[in-house]
Protein backbone atom coordinates (compact mmCIF):
# COMPACT_ATOMS: atom_id res chain seq x y z
CA UNK A 1 0.00 0.00 0.00
CA UNK A 2 2.79 2.35 0.94
CA UNK A 3 4.51 2.24 -2.46
CA UNK A 4 1.18 2.68 -4.26
CA UNK A 5 0.35 5.72 -2.11
CA UNK A 6 3.84 7.11 -2.72
CA UNK A 7 3.29 6.63 -6.45
CA UNK A 8 0.00 8.50 -6.15
CA UNK A 9 1.77 11.27 -4.21
CA UNK A 10 4.47 11.57 -6.85
CA UNK A 11 1.77 11.75 -9.46
CA UNK A 12 -0.06 14.51 -7.58
CA UNK A 13 3.17 16.39 -7.03
CA UNK A 14 3.45 16.39 -10.82
CA UNK A 15 -0.07 17.90 -10.95
CA UNK A 16 1.12 20.47 -8.40
CA UNK A 17 3.97 21.38 -10.73
CA UNK A 18 1.57 21.76 -13.65
CA UNK A 19 -0.28 24.45 -11.68
CA UNK A 20 2.92 26.49 -11.56
CA UNK A 21 3.40 26.06 -15.31
CA UNK A 22 -0.18 27.23 -15.89
CA UNK A 23 0.53 30.25 -13.67
CA UNK A 24 3.66 30.96 -15.68
CA UNK A 25 1.69 30.83 -18.95
CA UNK A 26 -0.94 33.18 -17.53
CA UNK A 27 1.80 35.84 -17.43
CA UNK A 28 2.15 35.50 -21.22
CA UNK A 29 -1.52 35.26 -22.14
CA UNK A 30 -1.20 38.22 -24.53
CA UNK A 31 1.49 36.31 -26.44
CA UNK A 32 -0.76 33.30 -27.06
CA UNK A 33 -2.83 32.78 -30.22
CA UNK A 34 -6.29 34.14 -29.27
CA UNK A 35 -7.98 30.92 -30.36
CA UNK A 36 -11.02 29.47 -28.56
CA UNK A 37 -10.25 26.10 -26.96
CA UNK A 38 -12.41 23.45 -25.26
CA UNK A 39 -12.24 24.31 -21.55
CA UNK A 40 -13.95 21.85 -19.19
CA UNK A 41 -15.60 23.43 -16.14
CA UNK A 42 -17.57 21.92 -13.22
CA UNK A 43 -16.31 18.51 -14.29
CA UNK A 44 -18.45 15.69 -12.92
CA UNK A 45 -16.91 13.25 -10.46
CA UNK A 46 -14.90 10.47 -12.11
CA UNK A 47 -14.45 12.45 -15.31
CA UNK A 48 -11.49 14.49 -14.05
CA UNK A 49 -8.88 12.51 -15.98
CA UNK A 50 -10.97 12.69 -19.14
CA UNK A 51 -11.21 16.48 -18.74
CA UNK A 52 -7.49 16.66 -17.96
CA UNK A 53 -6.70 14.94 -21.26
CA UNK A 54 -8.94 17.46 -23.06
CA UNK A 55 -6.86 20.31 -21.62
CA UNK A 56 -3.66 18.54 -22.66
CA UNK A 57 -4.90 17.95 -26.21
CA UNK A 58 -5.99 21.56 -26.78
CA UNK A 59 -3.96 23.46 -29.35
CA UNK A 60 -2.59 26.21 -27.13
CA UNK A 61 -0.05 28.09 -29.26
CA UNK A 62 2.44 30.91 -29.02
CA UNK A 63 1.64 33.88 -31.24
CA UNK A 64 5.37 33.96 -32.09
CA UNK A 65 5.69 37.59 -31.10
CA UNK A 66 8.41 39.14 -28.97
CA UNK A 67 11.10 37.40 -26.97
CA UNK A 68 8.76 35.24 -24.87
CA UNK A 69 8.27 32.63 -27.58
CA UNK A 70 10.80 30.15 -26.18
CA UNK A 71 9.50 30.13 -22.59
CA UNK A 72 5.90 29.87 -23.86
CA UNK A 73 6.70 26.92 -26.12
CA UNK A 74 8.66 25.11 -23.41
CA UNK A 75 5.80 25.70 -20.94
CA UNK A 76 3.18 24.40 -23.37
CA UNK A 77 5.33 21.33 -24.09
CA UNK A 78 5.62 20.61 -20.35
CA UNK A 79 1.85 20.94 -19.91
CA UNK A 80 1.34 18.30 -22.59
CA UNK A 81 3.82 15.82 -21.15
CA UNK A 82 2.04 12.56 -20.28
CA UNK A 83 1.83 12.12 -16.51
CA UNK A 84 2.83 8.78 -14.99
CA UNK A 85 -0.13 6.40 -15.04
CA UNK A 86 -2.13 5.73 -11.86
CA UNK A 87 -4.88 3.34 -10.88
CA UNK A 88 -7.34 6.22 -10.66
CA UNK A 89 -6.42 7.34 -14.16
CA UNK A 90 -6.70 3.81 -15.51
CA UNK A 91 -10.10 3.30 -13.87
CA UNK A 92 -11.46 6.51 -15.33
CA UNK A 93 -10.27 5.60 -18.83
CA UNK A 94 -12.94 2.90 -18.85
CA UNK A 95 -15.72 5.39 -18.25
CA UNK A 96 -17.42 5.94 -21.59
CA UNK A 97 -19.98 8.36 -20.20
CA UNK A 98 -17.64 11.37 -19.85
CA UNK A 99 -18.27 14.24 -22.27
CA UNK A 100 -16.11 14.39 -25.38
CA UNK A 101 -13.61 17.24 -25.60
CA UNK A 102 -15.59 18.93 -28.36
CA UNK A 103 -18.70 19.06 -26.18
CA UNK A 104 -17.05 21.44 -23.68
CA UNK A 105 -17.51 25.19 -23.99
CA UNK A 106 -14.69 26.84 -25.91
CA UNK A 107 -12.85 29.69 -24.24
CA UNK A 108 -9.95 32.05 -25.08
CA UNK A 109 -6.50 31.26 -23.57
CA UNK A 110 -6.98 33.28 -20.36
CA UNK A 111 -10.15 31.44 -19.30
CA UNK A 112 -8.79 28.17 -20.68
CA UNK A 113 -5.77 28.41 -18.36
CA UNK A 114 -7.91 29.46 -15.38
CA UNK A 115 -10.18 26.44 -15.86
CA UNK A 116 -7.20 24.12 -16.31
CA UNK A 117 -5.76 25.39 -13.02
CA UNK A 118 -9.12 24.89 -11.27
CA UNK A 119 -9.27 21.28 -12.46
CA UNK A 120 -5.71 20.58 -11.28
CA UNK A 121 -6.50 22.09 -7.88
CA UNK A 122 -9.66 19.98 -7.64
CA UNK A 123 -7.67 16.81 -8.41
CA UNK A 124 -5.08 17.64 -5.75
CA UNK A 125 -7.84 18.47 -3.27
CA UNK A 126 -9.51 15.10 -3.90
CA UNK A 127 -6.20 13.30 -3.48
CA UNK A 128 -5.22 15.03 -0.25
CA UNK A 129 -8.72 14.76 1.21
CA UNK A 130 -8.99 11.06 0.50
CA UNK A 131 -5.89 9.86 2.32
CA UNK A 132 -4.71 9.59 5.88
CA UNK A 133 -2.57 12.29 7.47
CA UNK A 134 1.16 12.30 6.79
CA UNK A 135 3.32 13.97 4.24
CA UNK A 136 4.48 12.91 0.82
CA UNK A 137 7.41 11.13 2.43
CA UNK A 138 5.49 9.29 5.12
Amino acid sequence: HKSSSQGQDRHMIRMRQLIDIVDQLKNYVNDLVPEFLPAPEDVETNCEWSAFSCFQKAQLKSANTGNNERIINVSIKKLKRKPPSTNAGRRQKHRLTCPSCDSYEKKPPKEFLERFKSLLQKMIHQHLSSRTHGSEDS
Epitope: D9, R10, R16, Q17, D20, D23, V74, I124, H125, L128
Partner: antibody, heavy 116, light 107 residues
Framework: QVQLVQSGAEVKKPGASVKVSCKAS????????MHWVRQAPGQGLEWMGT????????IYSQNFKGRVTMTRDTSTSTVYMELSSLRSEDTAVYYC?????????WGQGTLVTVSS | DIQLTQSPSSLSASVGDRVTITCRAS??????LNWYQQKPGKAVKLLIY???RLHSGVPSRFSGSGSGTDYTLTISSLQPEDFATYFC?????????FGGGTKVEIK
Amino acid sequence: QVQLVQSGAEVKKPGASVKVSCKASGYTFTDYWMHWVRQAPGQGLEWMGTIDPSDQYTIYSQNFKGRVTMTRDTSTSTVYMELSSLRSEDTAVYYCARYGFAMDYWGQGTLVTVSS
Amino acid sequence: DIQLTQSPSSLSASVGDRVTITCRASQDISNFLNWYQQKPGKAVKLLIYYTSRLHSGVPSRFSGSGSGTDYTLTISSLQPEDFATYFCQQGHTLPRTFGGGTKVEIK
Protein backbone atom coordinates in the same frame (compact mmCIF):
# COMPACT_ATOMS: atom_id res chain seq x y z
CA GLN B 1 16.55 10.76 4.71
CA VAL B 2 16.13 13.91 2.63
CA GLN B 3 19.01 16.38 3.00
CA LEU B 4 19.82 19.67 1.32
CA VAL B 5 23.33 20.94 1.99
CA GLN B 6 24.22 24.47 0.90
CA SER B 7 27.56 26.11 0.21
CA GLY B 8 29.26 28.36 2.75
CA ALA B 9 28.91 32.06 3.50
CA GLU B 10 30.08 34.62 0.93
CA VAL B 11 31.14 38.25 1.09
CA LYS B 12 30.76 40.19 -2.15
CA LYS B 13 31.27 43.72 -3.40
CA PRO B 14 28.38 45.71 -4.91
CA GLY B 15 28.01 44.94 -8.62
CA ALA B 16 29.51 41.48 -8.28
CA SER B 17 27.74 38.11 -8.65
CA VAL B 18 27.33 35.24 -6.23
CA LYS B 19 26.61 31.57 -6.95
CA VAL B 20 25.12 29.47 -4.15
CA SER B 21 24.92 25.69 -4.40
CA CYS B 22 22.48 23.22 -2.86
CA LYS B 23 23.33 19.51 -2.90
CA ALA B 24 20.38 17.15 -2.54
CA SER B 25 20.37 13.58 -1.25
CA GLY B 26 17.92 11.00 0.08
CA TYR B 27 15.37 11.17 -2.76
CA THR B 28 15.09 11.09 -6.54
CA PHE B 29 16.58 14.47 -7.48
CA THR B 30 14.59 14.95 -10.69
CA ASP B 31 11.17 14.23 -9.14
CA TYR B 32 10.91 17.46 -7.16
CA TRP B 33 11.29 21.09 -8.12
CA MET B 34 13.67 23.18 -6.06
CA HIS B 35 12.74 26.66 -4.89
CA TRP B 36 14.96 29.46 -3.65
CA VAL B 37 13.89 31.79 -0.86
CA ARG B 38 15.84 34.55 0.85
CA GLN B 39 15.62 36.32 4.17
CA ALA B 40 17.21 39.71 4.76
CA PRO B 41 18.37 40.44 8.35
CA GLY B 42 15.35 40.82 10.63
CA GLN B 43 12.97 40.43 7.68
CA GLY B 44 10.49 37.88 6.40
CA LEU B 45 10.91 35.26 3.69
CA GLU B 46 10.96 36.24 0.02
CA TRP B 47 10.47 33.77 -2.84
CA MET B 48 12.99 34.08 -5.68
CA GLY B 49 12.04 31.34 -8.09
CA THR B 50 12.09 27.64 -8.87
CA ILE B 51 13.82 25.11 -11.11
CA ASP B 52 12.73 21.72 -12.38
CA PRO B 53 15.91 19.63 -12.10
CA SER B 54 14.68 17.17 -14.74
CA ASP B 55 15.02 19.70 -17.57
CA GLN B 56 16.18 23.03 -16.06
CA TYR B 57 12.80 24.67 -16.63
CA THR B 58 12.74 27.80 -14.48
CA ILE B 59 10.20 30.26 -13.16
CA TYR B 60 11.58 33.45 -11.63
CA SER B 61 9.96 36.04 -9.42
CA GLN B 62 9.47 39.35 -11.25
CA ASN B 63 11.48 40.96 -8.43
CA PHE B 64 14.61 39.12 -9.57
CA LYS B 65 14.04 38.60 -13.30
CA GLY B 66 17.15 39.45 -15.28
CA ARG B 67 19.39 39.14 -12.20
CA VAL B 68 18.83 35.55 -11.10
CA THR B 69 19.80 32.33 -12.88
CA MET B 70 19.01 28.86 -11.57
CA THR B 71 20.80 25.82 -12.95
CA ARG B 72 21.41 22.21 -11.97
CA ASP B 73 23.93 19.42 -12.33
CA THR B 74 22.16 16.05 -12.30
CA SER B 75 25.45 14.14 -12.00
CA THR B 76 25.96 15.60 -8.51
CA SER B 77 22.28 16.23 -7.64
CA THR B 78 23.10 19.90 -7.11
CA VAL B 79 21.14 23.04 -7.93
CA TYR B 80 22.70 26.48 -8.20
CA MET B 81 21.34 29.97 -7.78
CA GLU B 82 23.37 32.83 -9.22
CA LEU B 83 22.44 36.44 -8.42
CA SER B 84 24.16 39.22 -10.34
CA SER B 85 24.53 43.00 -10.00
CA LEU B 86 24.56 42.66 -6.24
CA ARG B 87 23.61 45.60 -4.05
CA SER B 88 23.63 46.06 -0.28
CA GLU B 89 19.90 45.16 -0.09
CA ASP B 90 20.82 41.67 -1.34
CA THR B 91 22.53 40.95 1.96
CA ALA B 92 20.49 37.99 3.20
CA VAL B 93 20.40 34.31 4.02
CA TYR B 94 19.57 32.34 0.88
CA TYR B 95 17.72 29.02 1.21
CA CYS B 96 16.99 26.22 -1.21
CA ALA B 97 13.82 24.24 -0.51
CA ARG B 98 12.42 21.11 -2.11
CA TYR B 99 8.80 21.47 -3.23
CA GLY B 100 6.35 18.59 -3.05
CA PHE B 101 2.94 19.79 -1.88
CA ALA B 102 4.85 22.47 0.05
CA MET B 103 8.47 23.41 0.75
CA ASP B 104 8.94 20.20 2.69
CA TYR B 105 12.72 20.21 3.19
CA TRP B 106 15.04 23.21 3.43
CA GLY B 107 18.77 23.73 3.24
CA GLN B 108 20.57 25.23 6.23
CA GLY B 109 20.90 28.60 4.47
CA THR B 110 23.81 30.54 3.00
CA LEU B 111 24.62 34.01 4.26
CA VAL B 112 25.57 36.40 1.47
CA THR B 113 26.93 39.75 2.63
CA VAL B 114 27.21 42.58 0.10
CA SER B 115 29.53 45.27 1.32
CA SER B 116 32.02 47.69 -0.17
CA ASP C 1 0.55 39.11 -5.76
CA ILE C 2 -1.33 37.51 -2.89
CA GLN C 3 -0.64 39.23 0.43
CA LEU C 4 -0.59 37.19 3.64
CA THR C 5 -1.17 39.02 6.92
CA GLN C 6 -0.10 37.11 10.00
CA SER C 7 -1.19 37.97 13.50
CA PRO C 8 -0.01 38.52 16.09
CA SER C 9 3.52 39.47 15.02
CA SER C 10 4.76 38.25 18.40
CA LEU C 11 3.33 36.66 21.52
CA SER C 12 4.53 35.59 24.95
CA ALA C 13 3.34 32.29 26.33
CA SER C 14 4.20 29.67 28.92
CA VAL C 15 4.88 25.96 28.56
CA GLY C 16 1.55 24.14 28.44
CA ASP C 17 -0.36 27.11 26.96
CA ARG C 18 -2.61 26.77 23.92
CA VAL C 19 -1.32 29.10 21.19
CA THR C 20 -3.20 30.25 18.08
CA ILE C 21 -1.68 32.11 15.13
CA THR C 22 -3.77 33.40 12.25
CA CYS C 23 -2.98 34.09 8.61
CA ARG C 24 -5.29 36.08 6.35
CA ALA C 25 -4.88 36.05 2.57
CA SER C 26 -5.81 38.95 0.30
CA GLN C 27 -7.88 36.53 -1.83
CA ASP C 28 -9.28 33.01 -1.66
CA ILE C 29 -6.38 30.53 -1.72
CA SER C 30 -8.48 27.34 -1.70
CA ASN C 31 -6.65 25.70 1.23
CA PHE C 32 -3.23 25.95 -0.44
CA LEU C 33 -1.75 27.28 2.80
CA ASN C 34 1.37 25.92 4.54
CA TRP C 35 2.96 26.61 7.95
CA TYR C 36 6.67 26.62 8.79
CA GLN C 37 8.77 26.88 11.92
CA GLN C 38 12.07 28.75 12.03
CA LYS C 39 14.65 28.72 14.81
CA PRO C 40 17.84 30.83 14.76
CA GLY C 41 20.68 29.03 12.97
CA LYS C 42 18.52 26.01 12.09
CA ALA C 43 16.94 24.86 8.83
CA VAL C 44 13.33 25.96 8.35
CA LYS C 45 10.87 23.13 9.03
CA LEU C 46 7.54 22.42 7.36
CA LEU C 47 4.85 21.77 9.97
CA ILE C 48 1.56 21.71 8.07
CA TYR C 49 0.67 21.73 4.38
CA TYR C 50 -2.61 22.15 2.55
CA THR C 51 -4.19 23.87 5.59
CA SER C 52 -4.36 20.86 7.91
CA ARG C 53 -2.07 18.04 6.76
CA LEU C 54 0.64 17.27 9.29
CA HIS C 55 4.10 16.82 7.76
CA SER C 56 5.87 13.58 8.69
CA GLY C 57 7.56 13.68 12.08
CA VAL C 58 5.66 16.75 13.29
CA PRO C 59 4.08 16.31 16.76
CA SER C 60 0.28 16.07 16.86
CA ARG C 61 0.05 19.10 19.19
CA PHE C 62 0.37 21.16 15.98
CA SER C 63 -2.80 21.51 13.95
CA GLY C 64 -4.09 23.72 11.18
CA SER C 65 -7.52 24.79 10.02
CA GLY C 66 -9.26 27.33 7.83
CA SER C 67 -10.65 27.94 4.36
CA GLY C 68 -11.07 30.72 1.83
CA THR C 69 -8.95 33.60 3.11
CA ASP C 70 -8.63 32.79 6.84
CA TYR C 71 -6.31 30.16 8.29
CA THR C 72 -5.10 29.19 11.75
CA LEU C 73 -2.15 27.34 13.26
CA THR C 74 -2.76 25.97 16.76
CA ILE C 75 -0.27 24.52 19.22
CA SER C 76 -2.44 22.70 21.76
CA SER C 77 0.13 22.57 24.56
CA LEU C 78 3.26 24.64 24.06
CA GLN C 79 6.54 22.79 24.68
CA PRO C 80 9.98 24.33 25.38
CA GLU C 81 11.17 23.40 21.85
CA ASP C 82 8.23 25.29 20.28
CA PHE C 83 9.61 28.74 21.06
CA ALA C 84 10.41 29.91 17.53
CA THR C 85 9.11 32.02 14.66
CA TYR C 86 6.21 30.68 12.58
CA PHE C 87 5.45 31.61 8.96
CA CYS C 88 2.48 30.91 6.73
CA GLN C 89 2.94 30.57 2.96
CA GLN C 90 0.45 30.35 0.11
CA GLY C 91 0.88 27.82 -2.67
CA HIS C 92 -2.16 28.87 -4.66
CA THR C 93 -0.65 31.30 -7.14
CA LEU C 94 2.79 32.41 -8.29
CA PRO C 95 4.69 34.17 -6.93
CA ARG C 96 4.86 32.20 -3.70
CA THR C 97 4.33 34.59 -0.80
CA PHE C 98 4.85 34.37 2.95
CA GLY C 99 3.28 35.95 5.98
CA GLY C 100 5.40 38.34 8.03
CA GLY C 101 5.99 35.79 10.77
CA THR C 102 4.92 35.32 14.39
CA LYS C 103 7.58 35.11 17.07
CA VAL C 104 6.56 32.91 20.01
CA GLU C 105 8.55 33.90 23.09
CA ILE C 106 8.75 32.60 26.66
CA LYS C 107 6.61 34.57 29.11
